[in-house]
């Protein structure tokens, strides 16, 4: 999987002059239509409410550091997180929560109640997702928090728990 | 948050001539790769099944009017709505519904049953989302309808109930 | 709805020369910013776990064949599937599953348990979605598998069950 980053901002592109001076295909390929994206799967071992991610996923124009996606290019981003829960029901209902944080502030959350019958069953599956469309500046951090990280079953579902962002429109 | 709109259609862009005549960066920045988007949160006080939205959200190339997003530029749009419900369970099950309407016609809906055990519980959380990919013409309206607007908890979850659209591909 | 395909790859575009030689608007419109997308609704009659789709939906730069979307242009794709289930509850819980397959390998799955109270109720609605961001090569197949296709209610909800892909970034 490619993990290359985008070293130059479009302002550095010599659109007139250089080897590219009269070749429009070359010019267009270096035009200011930046793309940045990430798609990371949850880390195998979770031990806190702030989720950690496998940094060997897809990263392009976005950095990963200490559980955070760190934005490299300003613009309007589409952010989406999806989590697969597996709950061993106790004898009461359980509220599952997924929080999307921007710079450590809760920007959006999703909640679902499971085990509502109050019966102790073998297991209950629940899938929870949350999206966000937001302007993000350089060095903005994106992270995910859950109350009940113990219900994210990374052995059964190592591929199902993902955090993804992609730049929709840069801010030029 | 920016709420700027797009005043000119690309046909008005003087791609040859004008101040921009020989500056390719200038030309490219004004090229026909339009982007339009919206991200609105639900209004604080809901009193009907057609949802109202806070017009001070993100609006770019899309207008908001009377509960509708009004399309300004034709093309293929990705539309997504997400609602957070909080239900005080009666002694019967409750069907939560989210309808996406295009020009007042139901284009897509999502349904989930909660309180299925028939037990009166304190509360049950449920998150519901719906997306759509569709060609929309100028002045097309996008709106959202729910049966049970009283279960959309705008005081606890003012940020969780959103309607968003973005132009994927214009129709040039 | 348009079902046109993209006949030329950008390498065939005469960016210098031809009628387009000095008209930048013309050049830009034919520039190498390919877009490919699909939005298909589930077929009316389902009889196996691999879902079939109505090929008269939106198809642009993507082919449909035997339940598969077949990729025509390499790149990073956003893939999303949403299914609406209607379950006549038996006297045990039911696990609903949605699998996204790339080339017949499970790439991502979502599971939700319904009817968890073990009570035989009239019906329970459940909506399930799954997304994916992945690099796909030419001729890659995208398909959807469910355990319980009999619970996908195509008569009540013919429009609610969709598979959609769109190219986010081509691999040039």
């Amino acid at each position: 999987q490619r993990t290359d980053s985008i070293p130059n901002s479009p302002d550095n592109i010599p659109l007139r002059g250089g080897n590219c001076s009269e070749d429009l295909l070359c010019i267009l390929k270096r035009a200011p239509f930046k793309k940045s994206w990430a798609y990371l799967q949850v880390a195998k071992h979770l031990n806190k409410t702030k989720l950690s991610w496998n940094k060997d996923g897809i990263l392009h124009g976005v950095r990963y550091q200490d559980g955070n996606l760190v934005i490299q290019f300003p613009g309007l981003y589409f952010i989406i997180c999806q989590l697969q829960f597996l709950v061993q029901c106790p004898n009461n209902s359980v509220d599952l929560k997924l929080e999307l944080l921007i710079n450590k502030h809760i920007k959006k959350q999703a909640l679902v109640t499971v085990c509502e019958s109050g019966m102790q069953t073998k297991h209950v599956y629940q899938n929870l997702s949350q999206f966000l469309l937001d302007y993000l500046q350089v060095n903005t951090t994106v992270s995910v928090n859950v109350d009940t990280f113990q219900y994210i079953d990374t052995s059964t579902f190592p591929l199902e728990n993902v955090l993804s962002v992609f730049l929709y429109s840069n801010s030029d | 948050q920016r709420t700027d709109s797009i005043p000119n259609s690309p046909d008005n862009i003087p791609l040859r001539g004008g101040n921009c005549s020989e500056d390719l960066l200038c030309i490219l920045k004004r090229a026909p790769f339009k982007k339009s988007w919206a991200y609105l949160q639900v209004a604080k006080h809901l009193n009907k099944t057609k949802l109202s939205w806070n017009k001070d959200g993100i609006l770019h190339g899309v207008r908001y009017q009377d509960g509708n997003l009004v399309i300004q530029f034709p093309g293929l749009y990705f539309i997504i709505c997400q609602l957070q419900f909080l239900v005080q369970c009666p002694n019967n099950s409750v069907d939560l519904k989210l309808e996406l309407l295009i020009n007042k016609h139901i284009k897509k809906q999502a349904l989930v049953t909660v309180c299925e055990s028939g037990m009166q519980t304190k509360h049950v959380y449920q998150n519901l989302s719906q997306f759509l990919l569709d060609y929309l013409q100028v002045n097309t309206t996008v709106s959202v309808n729910v049966d049970t607007f009283q279960y959309i908890d705008t005081s606890t979850f003012p940020l969780e109930n959103v309607l968003s659209v973005f132009l994927y591909s214009n129709s040039d | 709805q348009r079902t046109d395909s993209i006949p030329n790859s950008p390498d065939n575009i005469p960016l210098r020369g031809g009628n387009c030689s000095e008209d930048l608007l013309c050049i830009l419109k034919r520039a190498p910013f390919k877009k490919s997308w699909a939005y298909l609704q589930v077929a009316k009659h389902l009889n196996k776990t691999k879902l079939s789709w109505n090929k008269d939906g939106i198809l642009h730069g993507v082919r449909y064949q035997d339940g598969n979307l077949v990729i025509q242009f390499p790149g990073l794709y956003f893939i999303i599937c949403q299914l609406q289930f209607l379950v006549q509850c038996p006297n045990n819980s039911v696990d609903l599953k949605l699998e996204l397959l790339i080339n017949k390998h499970i790439k991502k799955q979502a599971l939700v348990t319904v009817c968890e109270s073990g009570m035989q109720t009239k019906h329970v609605y459940q909506n399930l979605s799954q997304f994916l961001l992945d690099y796909l090569q030419v001729n890659t197949t995208v398909s959807v598998n469910v355990d319980t296709f009999q619970y996908i209610d195509t008569s009540t909800f013919p429009l609610e069950n969709v598979l959609s892909v769109f190219l986010y970034s081509n691999s040039d």
């Epitope: 990374t154 052995s155 | - | 691999k50 790439k107």
Partner: antibody, heavy 124, light 111 residues
Framework: QVQLQESGPGLVKPSETLSLTCTVS????????WSWIRQPAGKGLEWIGR???????NYNPSLKSRVTISVDTSKNQFSLKLSSMTAADTAVYYC??????????????????WGQGTTVTVSS | QSALTQPASVSGSPGQSITISCTGT?????????VSWYQQHPGKAPKLMIY???NRPSGVSNRFSGSKSGNTASLTISGLQTEDEADYYC??????????FGGGTKLTVLG
Amino acid sequence: QVQLQESGPGLVKPSETLSLTCTVSGGSISSYIWSWIRQPAGKGLEWIGRIYASGNTNYNPSLKSRVTISVDTSKNQFSLKLSSMTAADTAVYYCARDYRVAGTYYYYYGLDVWGQGTTVTVSS
Amino acid sequence: QSALTQPASVSGSPGQSITISCTGTSSDVGVYDYVSWYQQHPGKAPKLMIYEVSNRPSGVSNRFSGSKSGNTASLTISGLQTEDEADYYCSSYTSRSTWVFGGGTKLTVLG
């Protein structure tokens, strides 16, 4: 190199519950998925069920109401319980490693390491 | 879940090639590329010979190969040898997240 060893009673009375244990040596039980399979004399193989390190299980639908598979990571063991035994449950019972890798995709490598099997007879 | 369908027996002479078929449904063999083949000698545990339709584990002879078309998978053994005489079972992952086996095929090496 991972090795598996089944243990448990060779004889079970009708209507009783069979309890078998599989001990894993040469590797951590937490790193893989584990299955039980059985084979009546002169007949084919029948998959019974699997357990993940988390304790999550999948069972053969035809046996689901009678089967419980559990794991004890501290002892590097997993167990099978099969209730309401009848003569039709007489078979050789095998435990096996159910090798799945999750990288970019799920890759199912099949049942790649097996125990030698233990014979269970149901008789009064 | 119904067992996959295999021929009860096949035979061949040393040096020949034989093919064993395994027919499933659109809920198992047809939908996933997760077909395995096992070899079992009398009184022994099964041994994995092919996984994911056509892949061989290390240590398995390249005389063994697998393929699949539609709902049917096949195991081909070329250059048949006397030690290949055994029972062969196919297996497939199913939509219910389970494994299903074939009924087994007895391979006899003639001569």
